[in-house]
């Protein structure tokens, strides 16, 4: 999948654009909003009716190297009595993000953008049952 | 920066950390092509904390379209299909990395940007603080 080129109708390529070799793009990995922090409601992963745990995955050849993945704790959902309701399903909610992958080929190094699917948390859903004849 | 294990036979000139600016291939390595959550899952309707999806479009960003979730109710849907206000629907937020055209309007020059998106909603037990 390629980054879409800027449409001629909307943009005029400014003179200030840096020269870039064909088939590649220049990427500054100094992150804008680097210090932005998620202000999620307090420990919703434990208070949810579809609670989840977090696991940190670490890869030194990826930027950012740390990616946090959520896993639903239960198959069902927690009811008002604190018991698992097995007629409901805890399901993972996922979101795509971009990472930069560093690849070593012999002594040369190349960089590749990659889409990564992150499990963000879980939600409780009513199951759908299909009877296949 | 990030320390990279170096091939011991390689010249020692290479920086162990990710450089500030890199040249990357225009092709994104990606198996997850379905970026429209309306098509990829129907959770937003079936959840006990359902949400609506709003399209956020910005041609200076890649991906240019990001879907934002907004919880439909303050409470959660109970077994009878009614809103139970003893429970709370809350957004699940996630920081994601996107590409921002920099300088603006340039076709092949980008900078990574961290943005906060609401991905969906989950139903939680409210915390009640009694202030004397």
């Amino acid at each position: 999948r390629k980054i879409p080129k800027v449409g001629h109708t909307f943009f005029q390529k400014p003179e200030s654009c840096p020269p870039v070799p064909g088939g590649s793009m220049k990427l500054d990995i100094g992150i804008i909003n680097e210090n932005q922090r998620v202000s999620m409601s307090r420990n919703i992963e434990s208070r949810s009716t579809s609670p989840w745990n977090y696991t940190v995955t670490w890869d030194p050849n990826r930027y950012p190297s740390e990616v946090v993945q959520a896993q639903c704790r239960n198959l069902g959902c927690i009811n008002a009595q604190g018991k698992e309701d097995i007629s409901m399903n805890s399901v993972p909610i996922q979101q795509e993000t971009l990472v930069v992958r560093r690849k070593h080929q012999g002594c040369s190094v190349s960089f590749q953008l990659e889409k990564v699917l992150v499990t963000v948390g879980c939600t409780c859903v009513t199951p759908v049952i299909h009877h296949v004849q | 920066g990030i320390t990279i294990p170096r091939n011991p036979g390689c010249p020692n000139s290479e920086d162990k950390n990710f450089p500030r600016t890199v040249m990357v291939n225009l092709n994104i390595h990606n198996r997850n092509t379905n970026t429209n959550p309306k098509r990829s899952s129907d959770y937003y309707n079936r959840s006990t904390s359902p949400w609506n999806l709003h399209r956020n479009e910005d041609p200076e960003r890649y991906p240019s379209v990001i879907w934002e979730a907004k919880c439909r109710h303050l409470g959660c849907i109970n077994a009878d299909g009614n809103v139970d206000y003893h429970m709370n629907s809350v957004p699940i937020q996630q920081e994601i990395l996107v590409l921002r055209r920099e300088p603006p309007h340039c076709p092949n020059s980008f900078r990574l940007e961290k943005i906060l998106v609401s991905v969906g909603c989950t139903c939680v037990t409210p915390i009640v603080h009694h202030v004397a």
Epitope: L75, N89, V91, T126, P127, V128, I129, H130, H131 | S41
Partner: nanobody, 118 residues
Framework: EVQLVESGGGLVQPGGSLRLSCAAS????????MAWVRQAPGKGLEWVSS????????NYADSVKGRFTISRDNAKNTLHLQMNSLKPEDTALYYC???????????GGQGTQVTVSS
């Protein structure tokens, strides 16, 4: 396409045991949650038990907890339900179901009849 064939049902006295099996084909068994659901005469479907893709998570309806045990063999694409201390109220048609992580379930078999009676 999901294909599920249940077996192992029968007539048993109260307090007796049965082991139900479900042979699965047509899909990647190890990627699906699996479950047993049952339907008593004149009643709706009831979730009995389910298991995660690797079998490390299981859950049970309160009515069968401590008596029934669900298990899966991913190498053989088979799901089992060990039913002990059976009661007359366990009488039902038992179906095996395959579910995606998104909570979409398929039941494909004819079910297997379990009758608990003296």
């Amino acid at each position: 396409e999901v294909q599920l064939v249940e077996s192992g049902g029968g007539l048993v006295q109260p307090g007796g045991s049965l082991r139900l099996s479900c042979a699965a084909s047509g899909f990647t068994f190890s990627s699906y949650r699996m479950a047993w659901v049952r339907q008593a005469p004149g009643k709706g479907l009831e979730w009995v038990s389910s298991t995660s893709t690797g079998g490390e998570m299981t859950n049970y309806a309160d009515s069968v907890k401590g008596r029934f045990t669900i298990s899966r063999d991913n190498a053989k694409n088979t799901l089992h339900l060990q039913m002990n201390s059976l009661k007359p109220e366990d009488t039902a048609l038992y179906y095996c179901a395959a579910g995606t992580s998104a909570g979409h379930w398929s039941t494909g078999g004819q079910g297997t009849q379990v009758t608990v009676s003296s």
